[in-house]
């Protein structure tokens, strides 16, 4: 027993005077703690405890399960220890099978001796299965066997605690070892949608998946830039060994303008964190923006084909859409479509398709969507190009020659003259009178221009060219003179 | 030696509160998440409500979400259940039990306190 | 949630009789299914975890097995102290649920 300087407060002594005492089973326990100060007895094994407020304990008839470490306290704190082993050949291992270990930690598989002189205490594998190459252990009658730095791969591992008792090896009742992972990467983290659109009064509800080794990951939701807690609503699943889910589901029942905002879901562990964000934008009533994808006037040529295109976001989605045209509705040759698969998507293509569009077909086309909030439209005018076309050209009875063409832009009407039997006319003749005739009528289709000149002023045979034209093409009509004497004796007109 | 120990139970009013206490010894009490598992008389056992080793995430049955409250004091080794606005169909033994290797398993149970909700 | 439907909901039996009860999960819950015991006025006591791990201290007359939806808890050779109610309870998920118990009498 330790001896301290006089004065000092000294601990118990117990009797007999070792640190190990064998006993058989059915053997008498007779420890004696001397303390003038003597406080308690303490029994330890494994996860039990009793305490003896007698100076002197006896057990009459050990058994296996008194083996264990008896322990003297005095009134001071101070204590002596005995360790008891109480050998019955019929059980050498106490045992605790409750074995979890940390990775990456020791664990202790809680098989104690109830003697300490057997041999070749160890770990073994469950039906003579060998254990992990990498497995180490350091084995302690009293305690147990240490397993070294516990790895994930031991997890379900089967052992039993094994000793050699006269040459016979014993194994000890099974354990498993249950691992508890330790975070060697950040949580992933995912979020059911990246946005979400809602009209005031609509319930807002968004779930965050947590996935990692444990449940002991910890998440949460958050509002950026507020410290607001959050109602969350959580499901988990247990995937298998080291695959835990946690499903995190915020709910606002009735969102508000001011929630709109962005939304955090937040993860972290030991190793660190990671987050995702969804944004909310609630608005107090739904819209529909169109974005034609064209210019809305449009200049097609005659008989060509042009596809009118808008882009539109409606919220929420579009009950109605149609193209008009002159008070009529088309019921084919167009087709509407959302922008993008996505499940939050809000942008959709409209499109019309005309094709061989005639002088005729001009106007305007109107595109019209709703929803059950709003209407909205949007008109593209349609001109179409056509070549000029020479309606009348004739000799007027005042003399004048005339010539009236329509086509789309307005079409220019140049004279020429051209003598003798000449084809190429080349001399300029400047007109008397241009007008456009129809400028006040419908604003598409085509415009139709009358120009006249003096026939008086042509002395001689010939030709009389009326060219009437535009960005698209030209025509021509003609006029021929013959003279007798001083009369203009016929005057006809070809094109 | 592994033990919890519950507390708190009582007679109390509908609509009125009360708060448990589970005091937790012989283990690393913030290793572990921990419960709390009612069983009215003469019926089955109801999961109520759990919480991580560190107290960050709490989880509730549908039937007392909004209600009760858990939290734990890891410097206390105390795990707490708040139960406001009681309800009749409350009244139950309340045990408070330890989730064994983070799976959800009650290797370790309390003695249970008695709640008595009546008017 | 996860519905736990045990059956049957009580059994008589005498002593070093061979007893089963089954417990089905309404949707897979792989081999997360465990058996509490509880006797009149006490805390349940875990038996069987992970459906067929015996807990420490849990005598091997009790065994566990099945997986997905179909469990069964069998008592090879029922003793004295065996008279109980049994329940049965998923950790697959949250909320967690329990069967609705078996309750084992004497015969």
């Known amino acids: 027993q330790p001896s301290v300087s006089p004065g000092e407060p000294s601990p118990p002594s117990i009797h007999p005077a070792k640190s190990e005492l064998i006993v058989r089973v059915g053997n008498e326990i007779r420890l004696l703690c001397i303390d003038p100060g003597f406080v308690k007895w303490t029994f330890e094994i494994l996860d039990e405890t009793n305490e003896n407020k007698q100076n002197e304990w006896i057990t009459e008839k050990a058994e296996a399960t008194n083996t264990g470490k008896y322990t003297c306290t005095n009134k001071h704190g101070l204590s002596s220890s005995i360790y008891v082993f109480v050998r019955d050949p019929a059980k050498l291992f106490l045992v605790d099978r409750s074995l979890y270990g940390k990775e990456d930690n020791d664990t202790l598989v809680r098989c104690p001796l109830t003697d300490p002189e057997v041999t070749s205490y160890s770990l073994k594998g469950c039906q003579g299965k060998p254990l992990p190459k990498d497995l180490r252990f350091v084995p302690d009658p009293k305690a147990g066997i240490t397993i070294k730095s516990v790895k994930r791969a031991y997890h379900r591992l089967c052992l039993h605690c094994s000793a050699d008792q006269e040459g016979k090896s014993v194994l000890s009742d099974k354990f498993i070892l249950k691992v508890r992972p330790a975070f060697k990467a950040v949580p992933v983290v995912s979020v059911s949608k990246a946005s979400y659109l809602l009209r005031e009064g609509e319930e807002f509800t968004v779930t965050c998946t947590i996935k990692d080794v444990s449940s002991s990951v910890y998440s949460t939701w958050k509002r950026e830039n507020s410290q607001t807690k959050l109602q969350e609503k959580y499901n988990s699943w247990h995937h298998g060994d080291f695959n835990y889910e946690r499903q995190a589901t915020l709910t606002i029942s009735s969102a508000r303008v001011n929630d709109s905002g962005v939304f955090m879901c937040y993860a972290n562990n030991t190793f660190g964190s990671a987050n995702v964000t969804t944004t909310l934008e609630v608005v107090d009533k739904g819209f529909i923006n169109i974005f034609p994808m064209i210019n809305t006037t449009v200049f097609v040529n005659d008989g060509e084909n042009v596809d009118l295109i808008v882009e539109y976001e409606a919220f929420p989605k579009p009950e109605h859409q149609q193209w008009i045209y002159m008070n009529r509705t088309f019921t084919d040759k167009w087709e509407d479509y959302p922008k993008s698969e996505n499940e939050s998507n809000i942008r959709y293509v409209s499109e019309l398709h005309l094709t061989r569009l005639k002088g005729t077909e001009g106007g305007t086309y109107t595109f019209l969507v709703s929803n059950s909030d709003v209407n909205a439209s949007i008109a593209f005018n349609v001109y179409v190009n056509t070549k000029p076309e020479i309606l009348t050209y004739d000799r007027l009875v005042n003399g004048m020659l005339q010539c009236v063409a329509a086509g789309f832009p307005e079409p220019t009407i140049d004279w020429y003259f051209c003598p003798g039997t000449e084809q190429r006319c080349s001399a300029s003749v400047l007109p008397v009178d241009v007008q456009t005739l129809n400028a006040s009528g419908p604003p598409f289709g085509k415009l139709v221009v009358q120009s006249s000149i003096d026939s008086s002023a042509f002395k001689h045979n010939g030709t009389v060219e009326c060219k009437a034209y535009n960005d698209v093409g030209k025509t021509s009509a003609y006029f021929n003179f013959a003279f007798k004497g001083n009369n203009k004796e016929q005057i006809h007109p070809h094109t | 030696e592994v033990q919890l120990l519950e507390s708190g139970g009582g007679l109390v009013q509908p609509g009125g509160s009360l708060r448990l206490s589970c005091a937790a010894s012989?283990?690393?009490?913030?290793?572990?998440?921990m419960n709390w598992v009612r069983q009215a008389p003469g019926k089955g056992l109801e999961w109520v409500s759990a919480?991580?080793?560190?107290?960050?995430?709490?989880f509730y049955a549908d039937s007392v979400k909004g209600r009760f409250t858990i939290s734990r004091d890891n410097s206390k080794n105390t795990l707490y259940l708040q139960m406001n606005s009681l309800r009749a169909e409350d009244t139950a033994v309340y045990y408070c039990?330890?989730?064994?290797?983070?799976?959800?398993?009650?290797?370790?149970w309390g003695q249970g306190t008695l709640v008595t909700v009546s008017s | 949630d996860i519905q736990m439907t045990q059956s049957p909901s009580s059994l008589s039996a005498s002593v070093g009789d061979r007893v089963t009860i089954t417990c089905r999960a309404s949707?897979?819950?792989?081999?997360?299914l465990n058996w509490y015991q509880q006797k009149p006025g006490k805390a349940p006591k875990l038996l069987i975890y992970?459906?067929?791990d015996l807990q420490s201290g849990v005598p091997s007359r009790f065994s566990g097995s099945g997986s997905g939806t179909d469990f069964t808890l069998t008592i090879s050779s029922l003793q004295p102290e065996d008279f109980a109610t049994y329940y049965c309870?998923?950790?697959?998920?949250?909320?967690?649920?329990f069967g609705g118990g078996t309750k084992v009498e004497i015969k």
């Open positions: 039990a330890r989730s064994n290797y983070e799976q959800d398993v009650f290797d370790i």
């Open positions: 992970d459906a067929s």
């Open positions: 949707q897979t819950i792989y081999r997360y």
């Open positions: 012989g283990f690393t009490f913030s290793d572990y998440s």
């Open positions: 309870q998923q950790s697959y998920s949250i909320p967690i649920t």
């Open positions: 919480i991580t080793g560190s107290g960050g995430n709490t």
